[in-house]
């Protein structure tokens, strides 16, 4: 309908116009993680704060048990940042000992679980080798992109090592999605 | 109004439909920084180019004195990248000297100032230890997420060390926001 | 039209209301790169998958020959992540040999080509020195921001070294844009 006056009232306009303010949206923030079981070949999923501080869900976008639940089919922008921190990675210790220095790594995956597919789908992955010289290291991995999702899809954030996630501040580690 | 034809003209439609093209939006780009005073416990704020080159503000989103001014309440996507560059961090020098190797770090914070809260609110933080072996290092920190903002809120980007910010190119260091 | 009922049908409404679902959008994913010639002073451009797996183009946003083609003027959010991987960078080898340790680097540039300007415009750049201790390293560079584009503009992603791009998984290296 771009740039066009409204048609006379007897004509029908089929374009799905809708108010931006009623679109499903969520911004989730980090909480202290409790160890949970996960499949052997799958990274553990983070769980999140969904209503305190900066966190919110709105317009039928709900959070439950590590998952953001997609209430309406459409194109969504999905993003996450995970800040990791740790002590000197084994890599530098191994290097000092003269053994092969295969680097450690940190990985974040935003994963979709859908009724129509038996396997989770990895939507976004950020992965980084960590081979730090310093004794204490910390760094974020940021991800964000647009995906076509179906009503009923579920989104989660998986990490390679839950014990390295910085859960101390809501602005350091977060997860969000909004319908475009 | 999703998927629904327009109602006859005597009916009222209350959804706040609005043209996407008139939403507040800004993309600001780096300029050379001049030292400014800041609170002892707060990182210094960057100032920005708002109209030359790739930079723009539109639809009542204004930039003044380091701040993006939010003209309308709603959900905004906010983003920034800061590229840092420096000489060898002290960490590696300290390490060579055999002293404890506490790493240096670089940090970016997107901060909200609101008239309903006496403290600045940190919306997003990207922080990274820097313990580089090479003599000259450079790297970006990227942040982006969605937040509910109020009319009158002010946004700024704070960094841990203004002298390490790469201000040479508008595509390396930038800050933006748009109403969803 | 914010908060206002529709006007009677004989009145004209000039705001460019339009359905969100018909806006130009694309999410492209990595494919194995074939060496292509490029200008000596310009980084090589990646080519992309545009219809298989997670990749899609819609609503007149088309992909052809490394370029996303902008079908309609407006403000677009543009993003890309490129995951790089390599063996030990020369930097650490050079350092061990006692020579000057100029670091290697990895760079991603999102570039706009427009009819109205003879030179490509660099919209976004992420650049990072690589001076890794470990023998195998890998890391992503993420970029995203909003730009005002014109119908007919073309977007591409350039990288400093195509041979270092991780093309193994569609979630590791990607490129997208959508009209706001």
């Amino acid at each position: 309908l771009k740039g066009q006056e409204f048609a006379p009232s007897h004509q029908q306009v089929y374009a799905p116009l809708r108010a931006d303010g009623d679109k499903p949206r969520a911004h989730l923030t980090v909480v202290r993680q409790t160890p949970t079981q996960h499949f052997k070949n799958q990274f553990p999923a983070l769980h999140w704060e969904h209503e305190l501080g900066l966190a919110f869900t709105k317009n039928r976008m709900n959070y439950t048990n590590k998952f953001l639940l997609i209430p309406e089919s459409g194109d969504y922008f999905i993003y996450s940042q995970v800040t990791f921190r740790g002590m000197t990675s084994e890599c530098s210790e191994i290097r000092q000992a003269g053994r092969p220095n295969k680097p450690d790594s940190i990985t974040v995956v935003i994963t979709k679980v859908t009724d129509s597919y038996p396997e989770p789908t990895q939507l976004l992955m950020g992965t980084k080798s960590v081979c730090e010289v310093g004794s204490n290291w910390f760094q974020p991995i940021y991800l964000g992109a647009m995906f076509s999702l179906q009503e009923g899809d579920k989104l989660m954030v998986n990490v390679s090592d839950i014990s390295l996630v910085d859960y101390t501040k809501e602005d350091k580690t977060f997860f969000g999605a909004f319908l475009l | 109004l999703k998927g629904q034809e327009f109602a006859p003209s005597h009916q009222q439609v209350y959804a706040p439909l609005r043209a996407d093209g008139d939403k507040p939006r800004a993309h600001l780009t780096v300029v050379r920084q001049t030292p400014t005073q800041h609170f002892k416990n707060q990182f210094p704020a960057l100032h920005w180019e708002h109209e030359l080159g790739l930079a723009f503000t539109k639809n009542r989103m204004n930039y003044t004195n380091k701040f993006l001014l939010i003209p309308e309440s709603g959900d905004y996507f906010i983003y920034s990248q800061v590229t840092f560059r420096g000489m060898t961090s002290e960490c590696s020098e300290i390490r060579q000297a055999g002293r404890p190797n506490k790493p240096d770090s670089i940090t970016v914070v997107i901060t909200k100032v609101t008239d309903s809260y006496p403290e600045p609110t940190q919306l997003l933080m990207g922080t990274k230890s820097v313990c580089e072996v090479g003599s000259n290092w450079f790297q970006p920190i990227y942040l982006g997420a969605m937040f509910s903002l109020q009319e009158g809120d002010k946004l700024m980007v704070n960094v841990s060390d203004i002298s390490l910010v790469d201000y040479t190119k508008e595509d390396k260091t930038f800050f933006g926001a748009f109403l969803l | 039209l914010k908060g206002q009922e529709f006007a009677p049908s004989h009145q004209q409404v000039y705001a460019p209301l339009r359905a969100d679902g018909d806006k130009p959008r694309a999410h492209l994913t990595v494919v194995r790169q074939t060496p292509t010639q490029h200008f000596k002073n310009q980084f090589p451009a990646l080519h992309w998958e545009h219809e298989l797996g997670l990749a899609f183009t819609k609503n007149r946003m088309n992909y052809t020959n490394k370029f996303l083609l902008i079908p309609e003027s407006g403000d677009y959010f543009i993003y890309s992540q490129v995951t790089f991987r390599g063996m030990t960078s020369e930097c650490s080898e050079i350092r061990q040999a006692g020579r000057p340790n100029k670091p290697d680097s990895i760079t991603v540039v999102i570039t706009k080509v427009t009819d109205s300007y003879p030179e490509p415009t660099q919209l976004l750049m992420g650049t990072k020195s690589v001076c890794e201790v470990g023998s195998n390293w890998f890391q992503p560079i993420y970029l995203g921001a909003m730009f005002s584009l014109q119908e007919g503009d073309k977007l591409m992603v350039n990288v400093s070294d195509i041979s270092l791009v991780d093309y193994t998984k569609e979630d590791k290296t990607f490129f997208g844009a959508f009209l706001l």
């Epitope: - | 005073q37 609170f39 204004n62 003044t64 004195n65 380091k66 701040f67 001014l69 100032v113 609101t114 008239d115 309903s116 809260y117 006496p118 403290e119 600045p120 009158g152 002010k154 | -």
Partner: antibody
């Protein structure tokens, strides 16, 4: 150290306009918000309005909106209050307050008496 | 307007007593503020965001609550705490204060 100092006439005639200025030292007013609050004798505190010095955007108490104007001069790091058509009921201590993004800082207050 | 109803309007307590003041908003607010005002002085912020202690404020002062019901507590009243205490909401327009609670020593 951040300091706020209200200044202006202590006596205003009925129907005239009350004018006060608040001068801030030690902090850039554009980095925060500036409010005016008044306290009538033996009464509680009444918020009058605020200005965002960065943008000039104001919000006023609706009960005073037709009479109150708050402005700023960023070059002097000052904000000003004007209250028109005053009556004896506007006799009060007027406080300038810096709040929002910074811990509250109040001026010491300026007593204004409305009397003929 | 959001009305702030503060109670009691005055109280008298002994040194060392626990003192509690309540404030009820006529509609839900996210942030509540508590101020102390001593005679002839400007108010001083004690609590912001319902429960955060302002810088330099002794830890005997605390705040709690959410939505419409908020509480301000002095865990052990000291002679220097003689003052009038006000609650304030900063969200609705206009920003409104409670009518004040005058605290005296028995």
């Amino acid at each position: 150290q951040v300091q706020l100092q209200e200044s202006g006439p202590g006596l205003v005639r009925p129907s005239q306009t009350l004018s006060l200025t608040c001068t801030v030292s030690g902090f850039d007013i554009q980095d925060t918000y500036m409010h005016w609050v008044r306290q009538r004798p033996g009464r509680g505190l009444e918020w009058m309005g605020r200005i965002d010095p960065a943008s000039g955007h104001t919000k006023y108490n609706p009960s005073l909106k037709s009479r109150v104007t708050i402005t700023r001069d960023t070059s002097k790091n000052q904000v000003s209050l004007r209250l028109s058509s005053v009556t004896a009921a506007d006799t009060a201590v007027y406080y300038c307050v810096m709040s929002g993004g910074v811990p509250d800082v109040w001026g010491q207050g300026s007593l204004v008496t409305v009397s003929s | 307007d959001i009305q702030m109803t503060q109670s009691p309007s005055s109280l008298s307590a002994s040194v060392g007593d626990r003192v509690t003041i309540t404030c009820r908003a006529s509609q839900g607010v996210e942030y509540m503020y508590w101020y102390q005002q001593k005679p002839g002085k400007a108010p001083k912020l004690l609590i912001y965001g319902a429960s955060n202690l302002a810088s330099g404020v002794p830890s005997r002062f605390s705040g709690s609550g959410s939505g419409t019901d908020f509480t301000f507590t002095i865990s052990s009243l000291q002679p220097e705490d003689i003052a009038t205490y006000y609650c304030q909401q900063w969200e609705g327009n206009p920003r409104t204060f409670g009518q004040g609670t005058k605290v005296e020593i028995k």
